[in-house]
Every structure is written in C-alpha cells, then in structure tokens.
Interface confidence: low
C-alpha cells in the first residue's frame, strides 16, 4: 500500500508458512519497474530494466519492502515480483501489477474532539490527514458507557464530523475514527487513538 504522505509504496510480504521467515536464513528483494507506457497486451519489461529494493523481514512475521514511487507516477501501473534467496536457492514470484493510487492508506485522521451542541447532541469532529490527494470517507466507532446502558455504534460518513443524539448525562463516550478514499479503491487508515469525552451530570 501507499503511505498517506504518498512518499513510499510499502509492500508487505507474509508467508503462508508461519515459521518459514522465522526458522531460515533468507533474503527477500522486490524487483519493480514503472514502465513508461503500457500497451493493451501485458508488457514484460527486460530483466535489466527492473530496479531492486531490499526488504526488511524483521517486522511482525512478514517483510516490508519500500518502493519509492514518484508522485507523478502514482496513477501508473507498477510491475513487481519478489525474489527470495535462501541457502543458495532462489524463489521468484509471478509478476504482479498494481496501481499505487488505488492502494493509498491514509494517515489516521487528526484532532479528534467532541463537544455538546446547543440542542444537546454530541458532536464528534476531526480533521482530514494532510497531503491526501482525494476526498476521504470516514468510519467512526464509538461506545457509550453510563450507569444504565452500554451502547456501541459504527457509522460511515464523508464529512469530518458526526452528530450523536440521545446522549445521556454523566456518560463517557470513547471514540475512534479512520479514513479511506471516498471515490475509489483504497485501504483503511489505522484507527486514531481512542479519545474519551464525559458528559456532565444534570
């Protein structure tokens, strides 16, 4: 996926065999190319035109490969394959193609805060993360905890705020929000850190 600041395309490689990455000495490289033009028929670039990045395999039983994609080429198709070297044996994956712009994972929304409106509703507000090149949709999840009830809810909105009605005095509301591209494919951001708001007793 592409980081929210659009600086790095990150490819996570996870083995179906959970212990493979843990028990063997191996090196993982990602070979990639951004062809200038893609014809209607699949274009397989010459071997020498691929660039290679070393993948860091010390994270969460998977490997992280960082591919620098120029902003101007985010809409282009990235061709890539994995090369795994272990004990003198080389494994190579099939060729894969992705459009980085369709795999943007935004940073979590910022500035999550809550306040009571004049008409007694809870207004949850946040800011869009910076540098995202398109509008986002947001998923808001919140739980209400009072002496009488525990209520949980999950909403999808395109605005940067959400009104919650029927709020109870003396209740606490724990809220998180995450974002994803509104008008096309994309990846949900991580959830923002939960925030808690306590309504005042009557």
């Amino acid at each position: 996926w592409l980081k929210g600041d659009l600086k790095l395309f990150i490819c996570y490689v996870e083995s179906l065999f959970k212990n493979l990455f843990r028990n063997y000495n191996y090196k993982v490289h990602l070979l990639y190319v951004l062809p200038e033009v893609l014809e209607d028929s699949p274009l397989v670039p010459q071997k020498g035109s691929f660039q290679m990045v070393h993948c860091n395999c010390s994270v969460h039983e998977c490997c992280e490969c960082l591919v620098p994609v120029p902003t101007a080429k985010l809409n282009d198709t990235l061709l890539m394959c994995l090369k795994i070297t272990s004990g003198g044996v080389i494994f190579q994956s099939p060729l894969m193609s992705v459009q980085p712009i369709n795999m943007v994972k935004p940073d979590p929304p910022l500035g999550l805060h809550m306040e009571i409106t004049d008409d007694g509703n809870l207004k949850i507000s946040w800011s869009s993360p910076p540098l995202v090149p398109f509008p986002l949709q947001y998923q808001v999840k919140y739980s209400e905890n009072s002496t009488t009830v525990i209520r949980e809810a999950d909403k999808i909105v395109s605005a940067t705020s959400l009104l919650v009605d029927s709020i109870l005095p003396g209740s606490s509301y724990e809220v998180q929000v995450r974002g994803k591209r509104l008008d096309g494919p994309g990846i949900w951001s991580d959830w923002s850190t939960p925030r808690v708001f306590t309504t005042q007793d009557v």
Epitope: G111, E115, T117, S127, V196
Partner: antibody
C-alpha cells in the same frame, strides 16, 4: 504577533465579583478552544473553565460551577471569566491558554493575572 | 477524572547530570501526555507533546517516553537554564484536562 494578555486581577473581599479579560491577537480566536487555567502554590496548575470553538460549549471545574462564567467577544478577540461569590480558595494566578486540537496541549499562554480573595 | 501523579516532587541535581522525572496516570491514556517547563514568574512552556514528540525550538537534551500509564521526561545533560518546575498533563480525556502536581528541579 501571536499572544494572549490577561487583565482584571486584583485583591477582592470574599463574596465579591471580578471579571478577568484575555486579549488575543495574531490568530483566529474563534477556531480554538480557550481555557482559563489557574495556579496556586498548594494545588499547582488546575483548569478552571473552557470555551470551545463554537462559542456555546462551556465546561467548568466542579468547584466553580454556578459561580464562574466563561464567555468571549469575537469582535474584539477577547475571552472573559466572570467570577462571582469569590472565596479564599479562588486566590490564584489565572492564565488564559489556547488549546492545540491535534494533540490537546496548550501551545500559547498569557502571562497571567493575579486574583487575591481576602478580607 | 484521570489523576496524574509526578515523582519526585522535588529534585536536586548538578549541571551536566542526567535527570529523569516520572508521571503516572490513574488509567491508561495511550500516548496522550504532554510535558511543560515553568520558570518563576513565567507561564508554562510546552516541551514534549504526545509522550515523545519534541516541540519545535526545544533543545534535544529533552526527551519523553512512555505509553499507557507510565511516562518519563529525561534531561540528558542538565544546563543552568533547565532549573525550573516541570509538569505533565494528560490530554486523553476531556473535560477535564489534568496536570501532575509538578516536580521542582533545583541546583545541588
């Protein structure tokens, strides 16, 4: 220049009233949550009241509820704290402070105005 | 309300010393903790926000760490201008925003 300047502090008798002012300059006053924070040698730093950016949301620490009122005048970029039924334990240095929404820290403080409640 | 407890309440140290101040929250506040420095007659000044992010213009000898309930402010090599009172502040739950009771750092 981005700054906050408090005024209105003085020595008053218990039970009397006082109005503190905080003049803001160099930023759009109405887009921030503004706090009054007080400081005493005994209690350290303690929030007193907050006025959220929409101007209608106001919250108070329990000990001042019903006695203090926070308000603002966006035409003059001024925050107020109307204090009534003052008690000796309200004596403190009162700061006006601006809240940064992204991480909820105070990124701008005034220099404070001193309130002393004494007979 | 979330209670913030700082320790020690006062501390004597010398120029060049490494100093650590701790702050404990009464419940988990993730990384929503800020640190301020206050000198006599002055308003508090933000040093660290979000537990470990250094505020612009603050010397790199100041650092913050921690998550959940336990947090630390470290001054790697004390300078004469660092003698002051330090406060932590939780920004996880509002209202209220709450501060620690302060740690006074004095010259030994």
């Amino acid at each position: 220049q981005v700054q906050l300047v408090e005024s209105g502090g003085s020595v008053v008798q218990p039970g009397r009233s006082l109005r503190l002012s905080c003049a803001a300059s160099g930023f759009t006053f109405s887009t921030y949550a503004m706090y009054w924070v007080r400081q005493t040698p005994g209690k350290g730093l303690e929030w007193v009241a907050v006025l959220y950016s929409d101007g209608s949301n106001k919250y108070y620490i329990d000990s001042v509820k019903g006695r203090f009122t926070i308000s603002r005048d966006t035409s003059t970029n001024t925050l107020y704290l109307q204090m009534s039924s003052l008690r000796a334990d309200d004596s403190a240095l009162y700061y006006c402070a601006r809240l940064n929404w992204d991480y909820w820290y105070f990124d701008l403080w005034g220099r404070g105005t001193l309130v002393t409640v004494s007979s | 309300d979330i209670q913030m407890t700082q320790s020690p309440s006062s501390l004597s140290a010398s120029v060049g010393d490494r100093v650590t101040i701790t702050c404990r929250a009464s419940q988990s506040i993730s990384s929503y903790l800020n640190w301020y420095q206050q000198k006599p007659g002055k308003a508090p000044k933000l040093l660290i926000y979000a537990a470990s992010s250094l505020q612009s213009g603050v010397p790199s000898r100041f650092s913050g760490s921690g998550s959940g309930t336990d947090f630390t402010l470290t001054i790697s090599s004390l300078q004469p201008e660092d003698f002051a009172t330090y406060y932590c502040q939780q920004s996880y739950s509002t209202p209220p925003i709450t501060f620690g009771q302060g740690t006074r750092l004095e010259i030994k």
